[in-house]
Interface confidence: medium
Amino acid sequence: LIIGFGISGRHSITVTTVASAGNIGEDGILSCTFEPDIKLSDIVIQWLKEGVLGLVHEFKEGKDELSEQDEMFRGRTAVFADQVIVGNASLRLKNVQLTDAGTYKCYIITSKGKGNANLEYKTGAFSMPEVNVDYNASSETLRCEAPRWFPQPTVVWASQVDQGANFSEVSNTSFELNSENVTMKVVSVLYNVTINNTYSCMIENDIAKATGDIKVTESEIKRRSHLQLLNSKAS
C-alpha cells in the first residue's frame, strides 16, 4: 500500500495505490483511490509510467482524454468512469504485455487540490495447476500441469503424510515454451506415490504462488487448487 500526498502550491489530497501484478495476455488492474470530489467535471486523473514519454491515460471533464496518450498504451486503457466520483481512479489495462511492468504514477487533481502516488506493477504469467493420476505410468505417478508461467517458476512437491520430505529425487519437472515464445507450460511428475495421502504441487515465481492438491484414496480422488499473487509489498 502506498499513500501519496499533494504537491506544494494548492492544498494536497491523499492518493492511495496498491502494488499489483498483471498476467500477460490478459487484462489487469492498477489500483488507485483518492479523496472524492462532489463534481465529476473538477476531477482530472492522469496515469503516467516511468520510461514512457506520453501519458498512459487521462480522464478529465467527465470523460477519457486520449490525445496525449503514449503509443504503447493506445486502445488498451480505461478508467471505471462511473466510480471516479466516489474516488476510484483505478486503471484497467487490456492485453497486459511483459513491457508494461514498471513504476506508474496515479496523479489526481480535484477542486480540493492535487496528489499523487506511485505503484509498482509486475508482469508475468501464472496459472492454476491441475494434478492428476498418470495411469499411463508403470508405477503410481502424479502429473502436475500448469499451462502458462513466466518467469520460470520453481516446482516443489509436498505430502501431508511425509511432511518435510524432499521429493526432488522422485520428481521430474520440465518447462515447455508456448507458441508465443514467452510463457511456458510447466509439467512436473511425481513418482512412487502412496494411496491415502494428500500431495501438493507448489509452483512459484516472484509474481505468484499456486498450489494444486490431490488426495488419492482407494475409492475416490479429490482435487483442489488455488493461486495467490505475491504483490502485497509496501514501499
Partner: antibody
C-alpha cells in the same frame, strides 16, 4: 497563461557543450511533455527530443542520441537541453515547446553559434 | 520514422486570394479509437518561434483567425488561408505527433504576389 522563457544566446567552440534552459510559468509543469526543436539558419524544424518532467522520462531523436541530454527540475519548473561535442552544423536557434495537441506553447528561442 | 512532405515549397498569392498548402505523410496519422488525425500546422514569421495554428488536422488553435482552416485525413492534409492578409506572410510547417520521432514537413513559404 503558460509561458516558456529560455536562456540567452551562446557562442561556443567546436567540441564543447552548451546547456540551454527553459522556464515554465503559469500552469502545471510536471505532467506536460517539454520538447526541444532546433532550426538551423534558413532551414526547417528538427525535433531533438522530449521529457515528461514528473518522471524525468526522456526520448531522443536518433541523430542526437548520445549527444543530447534533456533534464527537468520540477522544483523550479525548468527544463534543460544539453548538447555536447558541438560542431559548426549545430549553429541554430533552439526552441523548447510544450506538447499539448501538437506544440501549443513555444519558448522565444535561444541562438547557439558554434565557431572557432 | 514518418516522413512529412509539403508542397509547394513556396507560394505567391494576391491579397484577398486563397492560399492552399498540401502535406503528405508516409503513413496514416488517423487513430481510429478517437477518430482523430495527429497532425498540426504551424506558422512561423522571421525571428519568431512557430505558432500553433491547427491541431487534430482541422481544429483551430486559440486566437487563430477563421480564415485559416485545415482538412484531410489519413495521409493527405491541406492548410487553406481563405483570404490572404499581409500579416499571413510567413513559412508554414505541418507536423505529425502520431508517434516519435515527431517529424515536420520542410516548410512552405507564403508571399504576396
Amino acid at each position: 497563461q503558460v509561458q516558456l522563457v529560455q536562456s540567452g544566446a551562446e557562442v561556443k567552440k567546436p567540441g564543447s557543450s552548451v546547456k540551454v534552459s527553459c522556464k515554465a510559468s503559469g500552469d502545471t509543469f510536471t505532467t506536460y511533455q517539454i520538447h526541444w526543436v532546433r532550426q538551423a539558419p534558413g532551414q526547417g524544424l528538427e525535433w531533438m527530443g522530449g521529457i515528461m518532467p514528473i518522471f524525468g522520462t526522456t526520448k531522443y531523436a536518433q541523430n542526437f542520441q548520445g549527444r543530447v541530454t534533456i533534464t527537468a527540475d520540477e522544483s523550479t519548473s525548468t527544463a534543460y537541453m544539453e548538447l555536447s561535442s558541438l560542431r559548426s552544423e549545430d549553429t541554430a536557434v533552439y526552441y523548447c515547446a510544450r506538447r499539448n495537441y501538437g506544440m501549443d506553447v513555444w519558448g522565444q528561442g535561444t541562438t547557439v553559434t558554434v565557431s572557432s | 520514422d514518418i516522413v512529412m512532405t509539403q508542397s509547394p515549397d513556396s507560394l505567391a498569392v494576391s491579397l484577398g486570394e486563397r492560399a492552399t498548402i498540401n502535406c503528405k505523410s508516409s503513413q496514416s496519422l488517423l487513430y481510429r479509437p478517437v477518430n482523430k488525425n495527429f497532425l498540426a500546422w504551424y506558422q512561423q514569421k522571421p525571428g519568431q518561434p512557430p505558432k500553433l495554428l491547427i491541431y487534430w488536422a482541422s481544429t483551430r488553435g486559440s486566437g487563430v483567425p477563421d480564415r485559416f482552416s485545415g482538412s484531410g485525413s489519413g495521409t493527405d492534409f491541406t492548410l487553406t488561408i481563405s483570404s490572404l492578409q499581409a500579416e499571413d506572410v510567413a513559412t508554414y510547417f505541418c507536423q505529425q505527433y502520431y508517434s516519435t520521432p515527431i517529424t515536420f514537413g520542410q516548410g512552405t513559404k507564403v508571399e504576396i504576389k
